[in-house]
């Protein structure tokens, strides 16, 4: 059936980047400016996505593929295809309806996006806190208290925690 249809349908010969123009006896016309067709046999070209406002163009539209957007500095993409841009916050903060807010005590966020998460509870794994948590960093768990009892093998003291803002990005 498909083969028969393609023999009868002149539009099936129109390649990507063109459309089958009913106003011109179904000849293949190039897509108008700022539009594209990514497959052959199309009766219309799709209008290109415009990256406006907090969006910026990551990939220009061509006659055969849509534009792609990302976000301007200070914002990051959300959702498939960067459908939304969300404001960045600093490490140690999370975005709320009222803007960026510091993480509450006992929580941290080591990224410019996302929410503050609770510090790891070392005792759940039978371990002790080796390095205290901050707004920007989770706690570091060490050996269990039993491992640190007299006679146990010595533990190399941890390196000092890095200052916030100096951690590798």
């Amino acid at each position: 059936f498909e083969r028969t249809r393609s023999l009868q349908d002149p539009c099936s010969n129109c390649p990507a980047g063109t459309f089958c123009d009913n106003n011109r006896n179904q000849i293949c016309s190039p897509c108008p400016p700022n539009s594209f067709s990514s497959a052959g046999g199309q009766r219309t070209c799709d209008i290109c996505r415009q990256c406006k406002g907090v969006f910026r163009t990551r990939k220009e539209c061509s006659s055969t593929s849509n534009a792609e957007c990302d976000c301007t500095p200070g914002f990051h993409c959300l959702g498939a295809g960067c459908s939304m841009c969300e404001q960045d916050c600093k490490q140690g903060q999370e975005l709320t309806k009222k803007g960026c807010k510091d993480c509450c005590f006992g929580t941290f966020n080591d990224q410019k996006r996302g929410i503050c998460r609770p510090w790891t509870n070392c005792s759940l794994d039978g371990k002790s806190v080796l390095v205290n948590g901050t707004k920007e960093r989770d706690v570091v768990c060490g050996p269990s208290p039993a491992d640190l009892s007299p006679g146990a093998s010595s533990v190399t003291p941890p390196a000092p925690a890095r200052e916030p803002g100096h951690s590798p990005q």
Partner: antibody, heavy 118, light 112 residues
Framework: QVQLQESGPGLVKPSETLSLTCTVS????????WSWIRQPPGKGLEWMGY???????QYNPSLKSRVTISVDTSKNQFSLKLSSVTAADTAVYYC????????????WGQGTLVTVSS | EIVMTQSPLSLPVTPGEPASISCRSS???????????LDWYLQKPGQSPQLLIY???NRASGVPDRFSGSGSGTDFTLKISRVEAEDVGVYYC?????????FGQGTKLEIK
């Protein structure tokens, strides 16, 4: 070619919730933005909001507290809910494919009239 | 929100004659990429609106070349070089620069 079809009750009582569904055929919903636009009888067009297939939404501030748009990619459908309706919400409701998130509505459904009346 | 104002609101035209509709926006629709975020739609009697012109001047694929759009910034014009009977309906301009997109009041084109 892409076709859109609205469906839902044509009559809704005041204070109730209006619910409509738009079914997309001839193409996947998993791309582009998808909008709802309405037109009261004899009047102009009003954009209500859009959804991206990933679920991101944006609404008209004039309706924001009452409108919810959702998507079901498995059924190639997206839906509109408008709560606490009054007679002023009587309109033809259109679904449309939105090329840029609030711009260039290239494909429209045929529209469905929803009357708000007791 | 951006306010769109069309004129005239009613436009009687003789078939074969040209027609022109004006649309003005309350702020510039020209974006930094030299793209005017202005669309024109035609709603024929009893039908859904259909896109005629996007980006101020680009004819949508399949739209007859008697339709043309021009203008930039805040002032835009839709021209029909030779009106045909099938062109009757209400013409709307719409700004697509800011959310929410907003439409003009509409211009009703009728045949004399």
């Amino acid at each position: 070619q892409v076709q859109l079809q609205e469906s839902g009750p044509g009559l809704v009582k005041p204070s109730e919730t209006l619910s409509l569904t738009c079914t997309v055929s001839g193409g996947s919903i998993s791309s582009y933005y998808w909008s709802w636009i309405r037109q009261p009888p004899g009047k102009g067009l009003e954009w209500m909001g859009y959804i991206y297939y990933s679920g991101s939404t944006q609404y008209n501030p004039s309706l924001k507290s009452r409108v919810t748009i959702s998507v079901d990619t498995s059924k190639n459908q997206f839906s509109l809910k408008l709560s606490s309706v009054t007679a002023a919400d009587t309109a033809v409701y259109y679904c449309a494919r939105d090329q840029s998130g609030g711009g260039s509505f290239q494909h429209w459904g045929q529209g469905t009239l929803v009357t708000v009346s007791s | 929100e951006i306010v769109m104002t069309q004129s005239p609101l009613s436009l009687p035209v003789t078939p074969g004659e040209p027609a022109s509709i004006s649309c003005r926006s309350s702020q510039s629709l020209l974006y930094s990429n030299a793209y005017n975020h202005l669309d024109w739609y035609l709603q024929k009697p009893g039908q859904s609106p259909q896109l005629l012109i996007y980006a101020g001047s680009n004819r949508a694929s399949g739209v007859p070349d008697r339709f043309s759009g021009s203008g930039s910034g805040t002032d835009f014009t839709l021209k029909i070089s030779r009106v045909e009977a099938e062109d009757v309906g209400v013409y709307y301009c719409m700004q697509a620069l800011q959310t929410p997109p907003t439409f003009g009041q509409g211009t009703k084109l009728e045949i004399k």
